[in-house]
Interface confidence: low
């Protein structure tokens, strides 16, 4: 057969769907690879062909669109499962072609099982809510296109395993779930189950997301350097190890890049010839405020090193701060040797 532009296996789009639920999967060619959409392709006389390779097999085979109740069907650039089965797992290929043009891409589809509490290997999206920030909402995700607007589905929300009803600060409102005042206790997995009728059958869509309550922008402050500070002096003798921790607290800020770095005599450690190592550790509070510690270490400090300026810098979307460490050379203790011989026993 003639050459086909093969985009290979697009592992960036690892699609996961639940067993025994409808799934609609768009051909990724038009989303990410080609500069035209399906309508343009169709009107230009191009045909979209689907086939697949079963899990643990090498053989490409056509998709059976003649299953009872049209369990698998294609509509424009969408492959439909009504519903999925566990053994639908595999690599799916959509190919766009006519006599002179061909382009195809494959993508993995994994059909996963969930237990009665909605636990599954599904990778869950995380939705962050600000703590004590007034009313905030989450929306049942990825349900567009499953039923027409004339159909009114029933939506049931769960936290963990349990139906959300009569909760103090969480109110189901159709496709939305409203948090009146988000608290740490609201952290957890929330599931919406959307039930809708279609051609005399009832289908369920299960969508779970993780809610993480994070620090509010109302409470956000510029970085705070706890160490170095004015109370601690790093006093060393030449030859000893110099260890200076830089510990910085960052308020949680959505999409903020938190940075900590040292300068020695105004230069980054990489730009000078001293044998310096820097080790970083990061810890988070329950509301995702961050504490970063960078320990600057010079194994065998010289008297020259003890005269240098060591400054810890920190930056977030809220601002930039810096603090110098107090470093000095230890003064040797005076040696008291009394010359007792002097003035005694002289004859």
């Amino acid at each position: 057969s003639e050459r086909c532009d093969d985009w290979g296996l697009d592992t960036m789009r690892q699609i996961q769907v639940f067993e025994d639920e409808p799934a609609r999967i768009k051909c990724p060619l038009f989303e990410h690879f080609l500069k035209f959409n399906y309508s343009t392709a169709h009107s230009a006389g191009l045909t979209l062909i689907w086939y697949w390779t079963r899990q643990d097999r090498d053989l490409e085979e056509p998709i059976n669109f003649r299953l009872p109740e049209n369990r698998i069907s294609k509509e424009k650039d969408v492959l439909w499962f009504r519903p999925t089965l566990l053994n639908d797992t595999g690599n799916y290929t959509c190919m766009l072609r006519n006599t002179t043009y061909c382009s195809k891409v494959a993508f993995p589809l994994e059909v996963v099982q969930k237990d009665s509490c909605f636990n599954s290997p599904m990778k869950l999206p995380v939705h962050k809510l600000y703590i004590e920030y007034g009313i905030q909402r989450i929306t049942c995700p990825n349900v567009d296109g499953y039923f027409p607007s004339s159909v009114k589905p029933t939506i049931t929300w769960y936290m963990g395993c349990y139906k959300i009803q009569n909760f103090n600060n969480v109110i189901p409102e159709g496709m939305n779930l409203s948090f009146l005042i988000a608290l740490i206790s609201n952290n957890g997995n929330y599931t919406c189950v959307v039930t809708y009728p279609e051609n005399g059958r009832t289908f369920h869509l299960t969508r779970t997301l993780t809610v993480k309550v994070v620090g509010s922008p109302k409470n956000a402050v510029p970085p705070v350097i706890h160490s170095p500070n004015d109370h601690v002096v790093y006093e060393k003798e030449p030859g000893e190890e110099l260890l200076i921790p830089c510990t910085v607290y960052f308020s949680f800020l959505m999409d903020s890049r938190n940075e900590v770095w040292w300068t020695i005599d105004g230069k980054k450690p990489d730009d000078i010839t001293i044998d310096v190592t820097i080790n970083e550790s990061i810890s988070h509070s329950r509301t995702e405020d961050e504490t970063r510690t960078q320990i600057l270490s010079i194994k065998k400090v010289t008297s020259e090193d003890l005269k240098r300026s060591y400054v810890c810098h920190a930056r977030s979307a809220k601002g930039e701060v810096a603090k110098a460490a107090k470093v000095k050379q230890k003064v040797p203790a005076p040696r008291y040797t009394v010359e007792l011989a002097c003035g005694f026993g002289a004859t």
């Epitope: 067993e19 025994d20 099982q113 969930k114 237990d115 009665s116 509490c117 049931t156 349990y162 139906k163 009569n166 909760f167 103090n168 189950v193 039930t195 009832t202 369920h204």
Partner: antibody
Framework: EVQVVESGGGLVQPGGSLRLSCAAS????????MSWVRQAPGKGLEWVAN????????HYVDSVKGRFTISRDNAKTSLYLQMSSLRAEDTAVYYC?????FGSGYFDYWGQGTLVTVSS | DIQMTQSPSTLSASVGDRVIITCRAS??????LAWYQQKPGKAPKLLIY???NLESGVPSRFSGSGSGTEFTLTISSLQPDDFAAYYC?????????FGQGTKLEIK
């Protein structure tokens, strides 16, 4: 050894009230959802209500909503069912049951039951 | 709420027989199903949870299968101690609901 023991059953007139208790031992009571399940004479099982570990969530079967209240005292490792506006159809053996691991919804330990008879 | 339909309601069998009890949910409950055994005057006893997981201490002649809406409890070789009532229970969505029960009696 896990044990749940119900008490408080008896004969009550229609419209009356009764409070059932369940004493739990042999497990960390505060870590488990707890439920009441009932069984009318010669009939099948019916789940009545359950309560979250800290008491912050309670769920009821529709037929008892507004009449029954489930509660717990973790310090006393006890579960309660306050029943009011009782009807003849509430006559049953009431079982206290522990739900499996967090929120699982199946019942791995049951008490022997306490009989509630609603009759005039 | 979800309805659970158990069949048969009564089952006559002999020691050594293979027995199958079925339970159908009015809508998909994934694998959120448990099976219980109950003897007269006694509390129910958990046999199977999550459709097919055998509760510890339950003889291996009991097994469960199914997912979605159709479930079965199988007793591979009936023993004298197995004559009792059996109930399925869903715990997937909404309130927990039990099947109406199957009475297993000696033929």
């Amino acid at each position: 050894e896990v044990q749940v023991v119900e008490s408080g059953g008896g004969l009550v007139q229609p419209g009356g009230s009764l409070r059932l208790s369940c004493a739990a031992s042999g497990f960390t009571f505060r870590s488990y959802w707890m439920s009441w399940v009932r069984q009318a004479p010669g009939k099948g099982l019916e789940w009545v209500a359950n309560i979250k570990q800290d008491g912050s969530e309670r769920h009821y079967v529709d037929s008892v909503k507004g009449r029954f209240t489930i509660s717990r005292d973790n310090a006393k490792t006890s579960l309660y069912l306050q029943m009011s506006s009782l009807r003849a159809e509430d006559t049953a053996v009431y079982y206290c049951a522990r739900e499996g691991y967090f929120g699982s919804g199946y019942f791995d330990y049951w008490g022997q039951g306490t009989l509630v008879t609603v009759s005039s | 709420d979800i309805q659970m339909t158990q069949s048969p309601s009564t089952l006559s069998a002999s020691v050594g027989d293979r027995v199958i009890i079925t339970c159908r949910a009015s809508q998909s409950i994934s694998r959120g199903l448990a099976w219980y055994q109950q003897k007269p005057g006694k509390a129910p006893k958990l046999l199977i949870y999550k459709a097919s997981n055998l509760e510890s201490g339950v003889p291996s002649r009991f097994s469960g299968s199914g997912s979605g809406t159709e479930f079965t409890l199988t007793i591979s070789s009936l023993q004298p101690d197995d004559f009792a009532a059996y109930y399925c229970q869903q715990y997937s969505y909404y309130s927990h609901t039990f099947g109406q029960g199957t009475k297993l009696e000696i033929k």
